[in-house]
């Protein structure tokens, strides 16, 4: 997260880290005791999933292996459309005050809605600085029409934009797959942005979760 702040401890109990060994690979969101939602471009053969801590690499955090993941069948590496994936945990999460599932959206929030994005991604770009603490940024949803003025053909129909005018605050490498939460519901998953990160007036781009609720529910049901 560029130009963000340290999240209030315990305020994001659904936030998970997908680790490759001990290294951060992506963010993710707990949606069920067996399931984590993340970005399709975060796909690996297997994952170590850290839950229940704001500190990356916290020894006291829950760590669960995951060997199965289900990318959206329409995901494109070229256009990043349908950048959404479900990761099935090998064993169920122990729910607590520190580990909770996020609320999936009942509706799509409108432009102008205030939201918070979080992650352990680099806080500087192009030179990288990875924080140990979970970082947050407060952003507002931007209409597709406004966002298309910036990204034109790069912006797909199920992509959601968020940012703050003239501000550098944005997501960056390592934040991918993490949550954009608006009014206590999951509205976005970090998908992409421009590189180097933090270009003013280049919104962050997210997978619009409200458009995928049926796919999420059906995939979890099929592979339970």
């Amino acid at each position: 997260i560029i130009d963000g702040y340290k999240c209030k401890e315990g305020s994001h109990p659904w936030q998970v880290a997908l680790l490759k060994g001990n290294q951060l690979h992506c963010g993710g969101v707990l949606v069920d005791k067996y399931w984590v939602l993340t970005a399709a471009h975060c796909k690996m053969g297997q994952y170590q999933v850290q839950l229940g801590s704001d500190k990356i690499g916290d020894q006291s955090a829950q760590k669960i292996k995951a060997t199965k993941s289900f990318r959206h069948p329409g995901y494109s590496t070229k256009t990043h459309v349908n950048d959404i994936m479900l990761v099935r945990l090998d064993e169920p999460v122990k729910m607590s005050s520190k580990v909770e599932a996020v609320q999936l959206p009942e509706h799509c929030e409108p432009p102008g809605t205030s939201c918070t994005v979080s992650g352990w991604g680099t806080t500087t770009s192009p030179d990288v600085t990875f924080p140990s603490d979970l970082m947050c940024s407060d952003v507002k949803l931007i209409s597709s029409r406004e966002c298309k003025k910036v990204y034109k053909d790069l912006l797909g129909k199920t992509m959601l934009c968020a940012g703050i005018p003239d501000s550098k605050t944005n997501t960056c490498n390592g934040d991918s797959g993490g949550p954009l939460v608006c009014n206590d519901t999951l509205q976005g998953l970090v998908s992409w942005g421009t590189y180097p990160c933090g270009q003013p007036n280049d919104p962050g781009v997210y997978t619009q979760v409200c458009k995928y609720k049926r796919w999420v529910m059906e995939t979890m049901k099929t592979h339970r």
Epitope: H41, H80, P126, L154, S176, S191, G193, Y195, Q199, D202
Partner: antibody
Framework: QVQLQESGPGLVKPSQTLSLTCTVS??????????WHWIRQHPGKGLEWIGY???????YYNPSLKSRVTISVDTSKNQFSLKLSSVTAADTAVYYC??????????????WGQGTLVTVSS | DIQMTQSPSSLSASVGDRVTITCQAS??????LNWYQQKPGKAPKLLIY???NLETGVPSRFSGSGSGTDFTFTISSLQPEDIATYYC?????????FGGGTKVEIK
């Protein structure tokens, strides 16, 4: 279809400034996510990245050339330019302009100009 | 700067042969690795992006693999039109850097 076309003098005298312009057609230089680069290739050798400019005017130069390079953009003409000062014979090369899709998830040069040979000689 | 070491610098193979080129990065670049083909007197052309993704319109005999520091580019069945120099390029960190190139010739 995006096209890039380099233009400028093919011969520059030592100690002078090399100036090249790249004209972009079929796409807007103001589009977010696309950066505009200069790359050169010495005769019979490999590719050397010089630097880029973004729609906002944000630039980044190769540290090895930074003190001599300036890249600028003219969005109204859909052009970007390279200036390389205090040239020597070692700057003789084919100069390419290129577009890069440059996202957090994916970055690559997808369109290139055909290249222009610049010879530094008195 | 990240150094990209490409090998071999040149190779000669027969039509129909499988050709493999390797590229090693001096540090972890994840999958930010691209492959380009350059024919004499022409600009480089993108073949593979993000280590393993085939650019639109590029024949399927070209492929790429790898992650981290070690990458491979393969032509499954060499064709006469594949005579060119091939370059790897890292896009993980600035400045972007290229490998030294591999000149592919027909025996």
């Amino acid at each position: 279809q995006v096209q890039l076309q380099e233009s400028g003098p093919g011969l520059v005298k030592p100690s002078q400034t090399l100036s090249l312009t790249c004209t972009v057609s079929g796409g807007s230089i103001s589009s977010g996510g696309y950066y505009w680069h200069w790359i050169r290739q010495h005769p019979g050798k490999g590719l050397e990245w010089i630097g880029y400019i973004y729609r906002s005017g944000y630039t980044y130069y190769n540290p090895s050339l930074k003190s001599r390079v300036t890249i600028s953009v003219d969005t109204s003409k859909n052009q970007f330019s390279l200036k390389l000062s205090s040239v020597t014979a070692a700057d003789t090369a084919v100069y390419y302009c290129a577009r890069a899709k440059q996202l957090t998830t994916s970055r690559y040069f997808d369109y290139w100009g055909q290249g222009t040979l610049v010879t530094v000689s008195s | 700067d990240i150094q990209m070491t490409q090998s071999p610098s040149s190779l000669s193979a027969s039509v129909g042969d499988r050709v493999t080129i390797t590229c090693q990065a001096s540090q972890d670049i994840a999958n930010y690795l691209n492959w380009y083909q350059q024919k004499p007197g022409k600009a480089p052309k993108l073949l593979i992006y993000d280590a393993s993704n085939l650019e639109t319109g590029v024949p399927s005999r070209f492929s790429g693999s790898g992650s981290g520091t070690d990458f491979t580019f393969t032509i499954s069945s060499l064709q006469p039109e594949d005579i060119a120099t091939y370059y790897c390029q890292q896009a993980s960190d600035l400045p972007f850097t290229f490998g030294g190139g591999t000149k592919v010739e027909i025996k």
